[in-house]
């Protein structure tokens, strides 16, 4: 789980070991702050759970791509 020591900086110290079904993912945000020990992605699930994941893993990249496509609006 993400850990906010000094708000507003949230850091991840451990990553989930399992793939999470993309059907259960609602959104994500990237953690790139130099105040954090590692870069991370925090997924928010449909039941509002937040999960730290490793941005180097393919399933994490696929999930972000999937969520990006879902939120894209048609260009006018």
């Amino acid at each position: 789980q993400p850990d906010a020591i000094n708000a507003p900086v949230t850091c991840c110290y451990n990553f989930t070991n399992r793939k999470i079904s993309v059907q259960r993912l609602a959104s994500y945000r990237r953690i790139t702050s130099s105040k954090c020990p590692k870069e991370a992605v925090i997924f928010k699930t449909i039941v509002a759970k937040e999960i730290c994941a490793d941005p180097k893993q393919k399933w994490v990249q696929d999930s972000m791509d999937h969520l990006d496509k879902q939120t894209q609006t048609p260009k006018t």
Epitope: T16, R18, S21, R24, W59
Partner: antibody, heavy 119, light 113 residues
């Protein structure tokens, strides 16, 4: 494509324990979240528990808490479900079930293992 | 826990006629941000494991005949077989996969009249 192959039928005496296995192929077990569902003769489907990646832990249905243990051997891609203190009402077909990365429901099922509890 | 209740427990329908099964959840299984209900319908034939027919309440699984359709949102759902075939004789279950513990309806047995 995920394939799940379960161990064979078992006959147990009341009070004993049973351990059912579920071998995964097509994926590695560590990529999946394995669950167990049982079905008593002529009855409906009953979720017993499984791995919840959102909490990063195995969760159990309240009914089976303290009596069931679900484990994994990732070196052989095999999941196990052990049920202790068996009683006649535990006579059922036990299924392992999982989903792939793209689905959140139980897309893949083992063939089922019949456990008969009888004195 | 979310309780799933199906009705009827069984129904007998003539070949070629419509079969309708209802499923009600005790809490909403709708994720409002994307308007998707996390409900799946399974078909189970004797001696076989369940097979997915419909997910997200209304999306037909690949390879499932189009006589099967799902509808509903939130707490009330319906599985419809538009023209019953002999091979559709089975027990049908709804299940919510919105939140753990995952819960099933008690099942509806469909037979030929």
């Amino acid at each position: 494509q995920v394939q799940l192959v379960q161990s064979g039928a078992e006959v147990k005496k009341p009070g004993a324990s049973v351990k059912v296995s579920c071998k995964v192929s097509g994926y590695t077990l560590s990529e999946l979240s394995m669950h167990w569902v049982r079905q008593a003769p002529g009855k409906g489907l009953e979720w017993m528990g499984g791995f919840d990646p959102e909490d990063d832990e195995t969760i159990y249905a309240q009914k089976f808490q303290g009596r069931v243990t679900m484990t994994e051997d990732t070196s052989t891609d095999t999941a196990f479900m052990e049920l202790s203190s068996l009683r006649s009402e535990d006579t059922a077909v036990y299924y392992c079930a999982t989903h792939d990365f793209w689905s959140g429901y139980f897309h893949y099922w083992g063939q089922g293992t019949l456990v008969t509890v009888s004195s | 826990d979310i309780v799933m209740t199906q009705s009827p427990d069984s129904l007998a329908v003539s070949l070629g006629e419509r079969a309708t099964i209802n499923c009600k959840s005790s809490q909403s299984v709708l994720y409002s941000s994307d308007n998707k209900s996390y409900l799946v319908w399974y078909q189970q034939k004797p001696g076989q494991p369940p097979k997915v027919l419909i997910y997200w309440a209304s999306i037909r699984e690949s390879g499932v005949p189009d006589r099967f359709s799902g509808s509903g949102s939130g707490t009330d759902f319906t599985l419809t077989i538009s023209s019953l075939q002999a091979e559709d004789v089975a027990v049908y279950y709804c299940q919510q996969y919105y939140t753990s513990p995952w819960t099933f309806g008690q099942g509806t047995k469909v037979e030929i009249k």
